[in-house]
Amino acid sequence: QTSVSPSKVILPRGGSVLVTCSTSCDQPKLLGIETPLPKKELLLPGNNRKVYELSNVQEDSQPMCYSNCPDGQSTAKTFLTVYWTPERVELAPLPSWQPVGKNLTLRCQVEGGAPRANLTVVLLRGEKELKREPAVGEPAEVTTTVLVRRDHHGANFSCRTELDLRPQGLELFENTSAPYQLQTFVLPATPPQLVSPRVLEVDTQGTVVCSLDGLFPVSEAQVHLALGDQRLNPTVTYGNDSFSAKASVSVTAEDEGTQRLTCAVILGNQSQETLQTVTIYSFPAPNVILTKPEVSEGTEVTVKCEAHPRAKVTLNGVPAQPLGPRAQLLLKATPEDNGRSFSCSATLEVAGQLIHKNQTRELRVLYGPRLDERDCPGNWTWPENSQQTPMCQAWGNPLPELKCLKDGTFPLPIGESVTVTRDLEGTYLCRARSTQGEVTRKVTVNVLSPRYE
């Protein structure tokens, strides 16, 4: 009778085992082992027992001891079970960002590992078991569905294999996949709100504000603001679940025309975008042209107003005839026109909006000098010893210099308060002089003596 020891062995893959083949007869003709495994005989005195070292055991095997005794041949098998932990434990790749409310399928693949009867696959969130299943198939695959919640943000999902050899007197061998860190997010279906000027003038600055509510996690939201190809650099302010991105936008003549203003909010693997058109326009103030800004009284003056080719102008409130970018008026310069403002107002329609620009020029009319009765009376009668202020106003542009002299030497103190004396009486020659010429006027001062009262 042939016997084998041990009859059952569990050993690590690639390991070695000693197998003893024995026979009950004293003088066997033959005693040995049949196995494809590399073997060494570990010699022992005697004929009825042989010990073999079987090495590099890669898979389950059933070496067979045999003996040939006088009463016949017999065999005995030993069962070698190889154990090894899986070579690959992997969660199928998933986008790290997942929207809240989505059903997320976790798929764990396990390659290798034996004995399969003792191999279990566990899907976990942190340390919480989501699913536990025996490893079946090659590769073994275990899946579970998770409804993504906001509080899953930052959670680690992993897959663990458990090769439980404790019933065989060994230990529990665990292998864990690389964790998958879930980033959850909420990006509302509503597009971001974009507030900006609809029209923007060349060489000016505008402010653009993009905002959105109901985001999670708001700090992870990326905001991209752009005007055409120009990326804007916004200052972003965050609320609990909202943000507001404010940026200044400067435009130049190269930007003129219709430009696309975009605000894109990217969160996770989703984005929301708002588009708006901004019309960049160039509209210089209209030009007011005077034949000459300074003319002499009586000169014919042409006032022209010229504006943007598409503008409509009014000159001193009078629309151009025909309505268009040019207007003009003709006048003969009078003293009353001195300091007169000629105002040109131009209106341009840009993207449905009316833009107004004004330009004003002042006309200077050179005239005079003038001395008339109204402003310089020719006769004053004042009581002696009274307080009086002689008044004589000369007109003209430029303002004339005025001097009133009696006998060519004694001045009348124009505009000054004086005590009337006999000396003041007499006829004064008032002379107004400017670059435009000179005029004279006689002014007589009469002093009433008290004895005449």
């Epitope: 590399p38 060494k40 005989e41 570990l42 010699l43 070292e53």
Partner: antibody, heavy 116, light 107 residues
Amino acid sequence: EVQLVESGGGLVQPGGSLRLSCAASGFNIKDTYIHWVRQAPGKGLEWVARIDPANDNTIYADSVKGRFTISSDDSKNTAYLQMNSLRAEDTAVYYCTDSGYWFAYWGQGTLVTVSS
Amino acid sequence: DIQMTQSPSSLSASVGDRVTITCRASQSISNNLHWYQQKPGKAPKLLIYHASQSISGVPSRFSGSGSGTDFTLTISSLQPEDFATYYCQQSNSWPYTFGQGTKVEIK
């Protein structure tokens, strides 16, 4: 019948070399392992080296590593121990023995004396 | 290296006595422990392998026991031919190491 016979021992000066042989009969050395074990005069047993004649894998005790080399010749069913840079503390009876974990069969031993 | 310590180093006993020799390993060696008998001028002889496995041709009065770190060789009834030195040896890890020996002498 299993038999192991050592030869090649003798007197050698410190720093000298010696080659011991172990001729096996009654079994094929490729089917097992061959070891050398030594015993200094009046002392205990010390394992020295092992060879797997099937693939020439070898293992040595730290005390002889780099100085001794174990080898085998399948055609002669013989194992060898080449001893170089011999020291006085290498003086011992050298036994060749078989098996992998225990030593069931031993040769009669060969004495190596290292002395000037 | 695993250190093997035998006790006692020597003992005196009479024919018919029960003799026990112990061997302690510096770390666990499972059952990878073997016993040898050596007489002066002779090569050692294997008595027990794997702590307790008997050898064909070795008298049944020799038995072994133990596992882990503590092992025992017992001679149930000492015979005149048993006066010799006994060694234990571990084969759990390289290098294989022997105990220092226990000499059994006639009382």
